[in-house]
């Protein structure tokens, strides 16, 4: 029969024959022959391969370096890489999470729209009219101005995006 020019899924072409790829978690030791299957071996400790492959070496698991603020979120297996995340109060600088930076705080006049996670920074938003923030914080949202009316008081000093309104007693009408 004619030697194949293409192979099925999970196979590869070598020396005019189709050999099975090694399954995830295993590396190639020797190609198949006319008589025998592909020779594969499992990846060693701290190694992985996440696809059907013909790699002769497994990849090393990622190291979550505590000196860079990293910790293990999910331990790697022979088929998956280790997933790193950042220590509390820090977040990854990239999708690959190779290092961490401190969560940013929202300045006065801005509130937290979305609290930071291990992989995303704090998202701040300007306090709209009727709201304020007078602190620099990674957690605090914009607070609504105090409603003087509900306390039977009147506004003595208008609020800003950084300050609350100041309420005072109503002027008594003299008889």
């Amino acid at each position: 029969p004619e030697p194949p020019t293409a192979c099925r899924e999970k196979q590869y072409l070598i020396n005019s024959q189709c050999c099975s790829l090694c399954q995830p978690g295993q590396k190639l030791v020797s190609d198949c022959t006319e008589f025998t299957e592909t020779e594969c071996l499992p990846c060693g400790e701290s190694e992985f391969l996440d696809t059907w492959n013909r790699e002769t070496h497994c990849h090393q698991h990622k190291y979550c370096d505590p000196n860079l603020g990293l910790r293990v979120q999910q331990k790697g297996t022979s088929e998956t890489d280790t997933i790193c995340t950042c220590e509390e109060g820090w977040h990854c600088t990239s999708e690959a999470c190779e290092s961490c930076v401190l969560h940013r705080s929202c300045s006065p006049g801005f509130g937290v729209k979305q609290i930071a996670t291990g992989v995303s920074d704090t998202i701040c938003e300007p306090c709209p009219v009727g709201f304020f923030s007078n602190v620099s914080s990674a957690f605090e949202k914009c607070h609504p101005w105090t409603s003087c009316e509900t306390k039977d008081l009147v506004v003595q000093q208008a609020g800003t995006n950084k300050t609350d309104v100041v309420c005072g007693p109503q002027d008594r009408l003299r008889a």
Epitope: N15, S30, T33
Partner: antibody, heavy 117, light 112 residues
Framework: EVQLEESGGGLVQPGGSLRLSCAAS????????MSWVRQAPGKGPEWVVT?????????YYASWAKGRFTISKDTSKTTLYLQMNSLRAEDTATYFC?????????WGQGTLVTVSS | DIVMTQSPSSLSASVGDRVTITCQAS??????LSWYQQKPGQAPKLLIY???TLPSGVPSRFSGSGSGTDFTLTISSLQPEDFATYYC??????????????FGQGTKVVIK
């Protein structure tokens, strides 16, 4: 044709050195582990060393072979080598190269090494 | 290094007999066990690999079984061309820094 052919054997004095070669043909040399196995006259096969596939193939030696024997390969020449130093009478054997590691799918015809004074 | 202990060292049998050879590894080797047949003046020939897989072209009268430390080669009905010496080969895979392989001492199958 898929084959392995050893060469370089012969008579050597105790303490001497010898380099065996194994020429591979008919298959992809770079993606196959290769092993050396020896067989003393009238005895069973004895594993010597294995070199894994890939450019920086890791090597594993039988404990008795460490330090005296060295495996290497030249992918461009599709040739496997076994450098043997400080040879002793008990190293007298037919030396085979074979394709594979956990199982040996293809063997050469062997080359005889005789260590004698 | 791993040690493979094969038994018996020799056996005499007749054509048509069922023959069983055993092999024991000094430590668990999963299913990394192969069997070879060798005839005088020839290199060993792979007969079974991964404990129980037959290479294509090897007659189905040969079979292998076992896992861990204990393995068996069976020839269901001995044929004239089967008179030879049989060797097991165990491969110890550490997954870290050191792998080793070893052969059994052999079983010579002779005509009764």
């Amino acid at each position: 044709e898929v084959q392995l052919e050893e060469s370089g054997g012969g008579l050597v004095q105790p303490g001497g050195s010898l380099r065996l070669s194994c020429a591979a043909s008919g298959f992809s040399f770079s993606s196959n582990a290769m092993s050396w196995v020896r067989q003393a006259p009238g005895k069973g096969p004895e594993w010597v060393v294995t070199i894994y596939a890939g450019s920086s193939g890791s090597t594993y030696y039988a404990s008795w072979a460490k330090g005296r024997f060295t495996i290497s390969k030249d992918t461009s020449k599709t040739t496997l080598y076994l450098q043997m130093n400080s040879l002793r009478a008990e190293d007298t054997a037919t030396y085979f190269c074979a394709r594979g590691a956990t199982y040996l799918t293809l063997w050469g015809q062997g080359t005889l090494v005789t260590v004698s004074s | 290094d791993i040690v493979m202990t094969q038994s018996p060292s020799s056996l005499s049998a007749s054509v048509g007999d069922r023959v069983t050879i055993t092999c024991q590894a000094s430590q668990s080797i999963s299913n990394y066990l192969s069997w070879y047949q060798q005839k005088p003046g020839q290199a060993p020939k792979l007969l079974i690999y991964r404990a129980s897989t037959l290479p294509s072209g090897v007659p189905s009268r040969f079979s292998g079984s076992g896992s861990g430390t204990d393995f068996t080669l069976t020839i269901s009905s001995l044929q004239p061309e089967d008179f030879a010496t049989y060797y097991c080969q165990g491969y110890y895979y550490s997954g870290t820094t050191y792998d080793s392989t070893a052969f059994g001492q052999g079983t010579k199958v002779v005509i009764k």
